[in-house]
Interface confidence: low
Amino acid sequence: VDSANHLTYFFGNITREEAEDYLVQGGMTDGLYLLRQSRNYLGGFALSVAHNRKAHHYTIERELNGTYAISGGRAHASPADLCHYHSQEPDGLICLLKKPFNRPPGVQPKTGPFEDLKENLIREYVKQTWNLQGQALEQAIISQKPQLEKLIATTAHEKMPWFHGNISRDESEQTVLIGSKTNGKFLIRARDNSGSYALCLLHEGKVLHYRIDRDKTGKLSIPEGKKFDTLWQLVEH
């Protein structure tokens, strides 16, 4: 993400839908584009491009050597270089990148979906648990926030596209192998009832499995790795 934060057309960790909304704001003209953080690929990006009044999305993978490429395409030193190249050469894209859609004044790249997600989960949790609405809901959110944040942080992963619940090892392999075979493609599944997980990662066409254990204090880590309070933090790291 550091390699793109300086770009005026980089929106950070926005969703595909948000990207499309921005492109609509920009007039949806052919070749209008923006860059965002990939939610599926570690260190990757996504390029959203308007063409024929429709948004088209391309995954930009970060290769092991630190270069960036659209699946099957030419490697570039940075996301900016990639966008510059595709402004002169479509090379598999639906059209040339003609005009970057810049962040509106005062808008910073979104640092990650967790903050927004956390707000939404807290709101939903309070709403459903205490059946509140309006001002009473807002007041309850403010008063309960510190306690709720910890609870929400530990379950936030369940809402993430990379968390696949209690699927089998075989199913997890099939899922990362389907579609593009890109380095860094991953998912996490629940292993058993002890609160442990497994990371299923695609690397050079091979599926690698890593155990994510929970220690006595409740912290999560890949064996011999750094410990995290939540699955969310482990993945973000």
């Epitope: 596209p161 696949h164 619940g165 209690n166 699927i167 075989d170 199913e171 392999e173 099939q174 899922t175 192998l177 389907i178 579609g179 075979k181 066409g205």
Partner: antibody
Framework: QVQLQESGPGLVKPSDTLSLTCAVS?????????WGWIRQPPGKGLEWIGY???????YYNPSLKSRVTISVDKSKNQFSLKLSSVTAADTAVYYC????????WGQGTLVTVSS | QSVLTQPPSASGTPGQRVTISCSGS????????VYWYQQLPGTAPKLLIY???QRPSGVPDRFSGSKSGTSASLAISGLRSEDEADYYC???????????FGGGTKLTVLG
């Protein structure tokens, strides 16, 4: 034990839209990744039509893509197939199946396209 | 014309070992898992082998799968009359971005 049951009209007129539903029992449709449709013309081999992921994203056979829509209804624990602008060539037994590797299959339903 | 190539027919006598081949390319069998299905007359296909050589529970160990390069094969040992069926291989194809099937092999148990 997972069970899949296809349902829908056995006869469809040419140029109409074929609509089938696959009811899933003994398994939550939200728990497994992929749900698919496969067809088999009489006396011929198997042809994959498409997959739907429980979140709603889809993969379709490129040769059928322009005519196919697969959707999922988690509340009813079922998923559906729509195939538009059918011709006699779409006459086949249609199967629904679970998982990328089609681990479980429905018993199939014969759909005949004829006027 | 199927993407994966299987012999249209195969036969054997009870007790014999029969092998069915499935030939593909680097974009399917060469880089992906192979699946085998058995379709008894008038019934839906049933998964026989997944991930090249794994058997689902309930499938007898008389059935085994293997893969080498861009080809795969299904072996049935101790052939029985109830094994008479159509057998299909399948694999994901990277180029087509879809699963592809073989044309099927009709296995006849003689005698």
């Amino acid at each position: 034990q997972v069970q899949l049951q296809e349902s829908g009209p056995g006869l469809v007129k040419p140029s109409d839209t074929l609509s089938l539903t696959c009811a899933v029992s003994g398994y939550s449709i939200s728990s497994s990744n992929w749900w698919g449709w496969i067809r088999q013309p009489p006396g011929k081999g198997l042809e994959w039509i498409g997959y739907i992921y429980h979140s709603g994203s889809t993969y379709y056979n490129p040769s059928l893509k322009s005519r196919v829509t697969i959707s999922v209804d988690k509340s009813k624990n079922q998923f559906s197939l729509k195939l538009s602008s059918v011709t006699a060539a779409d006459t086949a037994v249609y199967y629904c199946a679970r998982n990328v590797g089609f681990h479980d299959w429905g018993q199939g339903t014969l759909v005949t396209v004829s006027s | 014309q199927s993407v994966l190539t299987q012999p249209p027919s195969a036969s054997g006598t009870p007790g014999q070992r029969v092998t069915i081949s499935c030939s593909g390319s680097s974009s399917n069998i060469g880089s992906n898992y192979v699946y085998w299905y058995q379709q008894l007359p008038g019934t839906a296909p049933k998964l026989l082998i997944y991930r090249n050589n794994q058997r689902p529970s309930g499938v007898p160990d008389r059935f085994s799968g293997s893969k080498s390069g861009t080809s795969a094969s299904l072996a049935i040992s101790g052939l029985r009359s109830e094994d008479e069926a159509d057998y299909y291989c399948a694999a994901w194809d990277d180029s087509l971005a879809s699963p592809v099937f073989g044309g099927g092999t009709k296995l006849t148990v003689l005698g």
